[in-house]
Amino acid sequence: RAPRCRELPAQKWWHTGALYRIGDLQAFQGHGAGNLAGLKGRLDYLSSLKVKGLVLGPIHKNQKDDVAQTDLLQIDPNFGSKEDFDSLLQSAKKKSIRVILDLTPNYRGENSWFSTQVDTVATKVKDALEFWLQAGVDGFQVRDIENLKDASSFLAEWQNITKGFSEDRLLIAGTNSSDLQQILSLLESNKDLLLTSSYLSDSGSTGEHTKSLVTQYLNATGNRWCSWSLSQARLLTSFLPAQLLRLYQLMLFTLPGTPVFSYGDEIGLDAAALPGQPMEAPVMLWDESSFPDIPGAVSANMTVKGQSEDPGSLLSLFRRLSDQRSKERSLLHGDFHAFSAGPGLFSYIRHWDQNERFLVVLNFGDVGLSAGLQASDLPASASLPAKADLLLSTQPGREEGSPLELERLKLEPHEGLLLRFPYAA
């Protein structure tokens, strides 16, 4: 008799794919534009990325450091009107893109939470949650919570409001902290909170270090759902050299949890390459005319337009990974097992019941390496076959779909492989 199928876990929409942050509408749209109506015109692009949610803003009225002139219920007229927002929501829903609103109060000021008036601000947040939930938003984000006194209890209260409205609504909290104990204490009192942090931001050095960070985090958080990013707001290029971007895309899309990206991560947008652009929010490069300040500074391969036409580009890789992440059971909610593959490498398996299984091998080093996959580290339920088919490599030149012998696996510098193999009873 065939073995019984394992019962599928309850899946919320944010479990099914990536979130895409647009923290600065004006930088995202460029050309002196930057409003909600313009963003509506970019939803087809977001659809093409197969992202499940858009984390927007903050877009509320905020006069720098002035509580009285900060209104979480009013959209800053520079971004548009309430009607523009409603229209964006409707269009996003039609495209199955959820909208998460960032309500970090003093986003233009020194302290995001007006440290001297915490209770007033917390009440304003509560009211805003109620208001925008009814407006139809799918969730909220609050950042810099290390600056919020009694953050855990406020987050618990806001979570109750959000979940009380519907289990299908999400609360994201962001912190600049990279300290695991601080992160765990924030998570402890908030069961379904999705937390973005700087935990992985210094992991770029070695495969061993990255492996230990990821496994420590997963062990410490138990069976709760995680999110994966390198920070609460900034671009991957703020932390990583260009040669590791593909590797990190592959990793973030295949770890168990929700990958969270900032606009531009999909093309390797890098403020350092654009003189005069702010690190936190450089202008999005739609095409070569997006950055007219310095003629010739932007080449086609740095832009959405140029990369869309190149199957070997970072953007094409992002789209492929996003697509896989959203449709393969093993990547959606499969078990995770990391195992040894040799110095400089990080490797793991994702598997779910009798579905197709995935092997990820990542070479963080700048030399080519032979992988010594230690299958003995794996439980019986996740054993390795002799061969697995290459689904994709982060480097060009490999023949996709071809079976690779796992005992003879060699990786190029900074190469990541995504391989697949069938369940064997």
Partner: nanobody, 125 residues
């Protein structure tokens, strides 16, 4: 069951002011989001303003901002609408509404479970 009774309507000249009141029954008034709506003859009911449970947050229809002010006194179970610089186009029946599910009312009237009978405001030119 929540009962709402509006008062303060009447006839006023353009440029004048009125203050509408809405008294609510029930001991849990401080847990309701409250709103004001209005309906002009032959038109649909439209949103005017909403105020949160504590009164900390308010939200207004764009066209009325600056002229109308919503406030509440939880000790008196009453919500108010102060209307200044009135115009003939403000002529309508004004309704007060309570949202017992949410601390912050919304701009769509579907979220409000309880409604008053309305009070007529007429602005003559």
């Amino acid at each position: 069951q929540v009962q709402l009774v509006e008062s303060g309507g009447g006839l006023v000249q353009a440029g004048g002011s009125l203050r509408l009141s809405c008294a609510a029954s029930g001991r849990t008034f401080s847990r309701y989001g409250m709103g004001w709506f209005r309906q002009a003859p032959g038109k649909e009911r439209e949103f005017v303003a909403t105020i949160s449970c504590s009164g900390t947050s308010t939200y207004y229809a764009d066209s009325l901002k600056g002229r109308f002010t919503i406030s509440r006194d939880n000790a008196k179970n009453t919500v108010y609408l102060q209307m200044n610089s009135l115009k003939p186009e403000d002529t309508a029946v004004y309704f007060c509404a309570a949202d017992t599910r949410h601390c912050m009312g919304y701009t769509k009237d579907g979220g409000y479970a309880y409604w008053g009978q309305g009070t007529q405001v007429t602005v003559s030119s």
